[in-house]
């Protein structure tokens, strides 16, 4: 049968800067097609048990599936198909009109990048290593991308970079951070991750395979334009503040949905990973920029109104984002009580 469980079935995830998440496209007959989220009798804003797509994630060399549901961006020029029958079956599909199709998105866990453990520093008689220097961002939680502790490798030597009080004092322009994010193909620099986020933030119960490397480097030239001139070797040590960055290309991004009687209005729910939860009202939520973005993600028209619902219940829990826009949120913070839900109305493009 023609299904995504067939070992020869070709899928790809597009419209994202991560190969393990994006809009699902499938190859059938003579070309690639975008799959509509209304396929297999689902409604366009319904979320599925992601485990049903585990074979897809596996074949893409990604980790376990985290989410399967509507994707935010559509390419109107692409072949779009709606399929029928059992979820993941492509035996019976029809081409869909441009206006009715909402793409299906899939997020798989990013595989942990494993780096061979660095060897001991060579004896002083050995000539300097000649392999090109390289950088790596080591995320503390599996599947994170473009956020974490910076590791610098030069030849056989690899380690983290010291980032102490004096570096912070001199570091006003953040030229180095932008250069590092850009060298890592992670966009531009957003913020420094505090030590707690960088060195200890782990998903509960998750053991990190990649143990932190010792500090081997310090910043030599913060306006460097090639990696070999940025850092200098120091005597290795195992404690101290290290350079940890969050770049604009971080993944996974926060996803939002509106839960209500129509696609374009309802209480806002968010997730970053597997679990949906209510978005709590906060001072940063006052900006219309946040809600414009939410409306856009639902593929609705412009933002109409937002209303914070009464949080009389001390047990009401949710997630909040300290930034103006949800797309800037690297980590949602959990609110265990008095979470004021938010009701947003967007313009319905098809009233």
């Amino acid at each position: 049968r023609l299904s995504w469980d067939d070992p020869d079935f070709q899928t790809r995830l597009t419209r994202s800067n991560s190969r393990c998440q994006g809009q699902l496209e499938v190859y059938i007959k003579y070309g690639w097609h975008m799959v509509c989220s209304q396929s297999w009798g689902r409604s366009s804003n319904q979320w599925e048990d992601p485990n049903q797509a585990s074979k897809v994630c596996q074949r893409l060399n990604c980790g376990v599936p985290l989410s399967l549901g509507p994707f935010l961006i559509t390419d109107r020029h692409q072949s779009q198909i709606t399929c029928y029958g059992r979820l993941g079956s492509f035996s019976n599909c029809s081409h869909s009109g441009r206006d009715v199709c909402r793409p299906l998105g899939l997020t798989c866990l990013e595989p942990q990048t494993t780096t061979p453990p660095p060897t001991r520093p060579p004896p002083t008689t050995t000539p300097e290593p000649t392999a090109p220097p390289r950088l790596q961002l080591v995320a503390q939680a599996a599947g994170r991308h473009c956020a974490g502790v910076v590791e610098f490798y030069s030849g056989s030597l690899g380690g983290t970079i010291s980032y102490e009080a004096q570096d912070k004092a001199q570091d006003k322009t953040q030229v180095l951070e932008n250069f590092l994010c850009s060298s890592l193909q992670c966009g531009s620099f957003l913020k420094h991750l505090p030590e707690t986020e960088a060195a200890t933030a782990q998903d509960p119960g998750e053991l990190r395979e990649h143990q932190p490397l010792p500090i081997q480097w310090t910043i030599r030239n913060s306006s460097c334009t090639s990696l070999e001139h940025c850092f200098q070797k120091i005597k290795p040590r195992n404690s101290g503040q290290v350079l940890a960055l969050l770049c604009s290309g971080f993944q996974p991004k926060v996803q939002s949905r509106l839960v209500g009687s129509s696609i374009c209005e309802g209480t806002v729910e968010v997730r970053q990973g597997a679990q949906w939860a209510a978005l709590c009202d906060s001072s940063s939520a006052k900006s219309s920029l946040r809600w414009e973005e939410v409306c856009r993600e639902q593929q609705c028209g412009s933002f109409n109104s937002y209303q914070a619902l009464d949080a009389g219940d001390p047990t009401s829990r949710g997630l909040s984002c300290p930034h103006q826009k949800l797309s800037q949120c690297h980590e949602l913070t959990e609110r265990k009580s008095y979470c004021k839900k938010v009701f947003v109305t967007c313009q319905d493009p098809n009233p």
């Epitope: 049968r1 023609l2 067939d6 020869d8 070709q10 007959k29 003579y30 035996s91």
Partner: antibody
Framework: QVTLKESGPGILKPSQTLSLTCSFS??????????VGWIRQPSGKGLEWLAH???????YYNPSLKNQLTISKDASRDQVFLKITNLDTADTATYYC????????????WGQGTTLTVSS | NIVMTQSHKFMSTSVGDRVSIACKAS??????VAWYQQKPGQSPKLLIY???TRHTGVPDRFTGSGSGTDFTLTITNVQSEDLADYFC????????FGSGTRLELK
Amino acid sequence: QVTLKESGPGILKPSQTLSLTCSFSGFSLSTSGMGVGWIRQPSGKGLEWLAHIWWDDDVYYNPSLKNQLTISKDASRDQVFLKITNLDTADTATYYCVRRRATGTGFDYWGQGTTLTVSS
Amino acid sequence: NIVMTQSHKFMSTSVGDRVSIACKASQDVGTAVAWYQQKPGQSPKLLIYWTSTRHTGVPDRFTGSGSGTDFTLTITNVQSEDLADYFCHQYNSYNTFGSGTRLELK
């Protein structure tokens, strides 16, 4: 095991219509994802894809020959047919019947070919 | 129509050699490329599909590589039975074949 066998008239005159039949076994065109098509090869030259028909009756034609070609199937009899109208001497070639799955695994099985000569 | 160009009509090799047959697409075809072997008087046989996946029963001395517009079929440790015509095929948009490369003995 999968086999495909072509049959055709052998010799025709210019402007006539060619009718080819492909009889296959070892798979069914009622199975989703299955397709059968036609490819030709003039003697000592390259391969040219002509047409393809799928399990769901979806058909694809080579855009440069579309107006001359008609492909059809009888899934219950395990047969696929190709008609080429308004023949020309340039249509002299060996015609192959091929199987291809919708997952894009290439033309995985080929018939032995039937030779057509178009001559006045 | 996407044009597939096999720039070498003929390639000479010796038994035990390694040979690479090139194929270039006129536009990006992703990895939707297959390779076929055809011996005189026989039908073509599928060797490789999706650029690098070997068809059932194909010896592992045949490997495919590439993506986008440039593709290569490599035969390591060439055997006398490998002397044949080789065709590349794109199926990203309809189907088009390369004109073929004949592998012959030096």
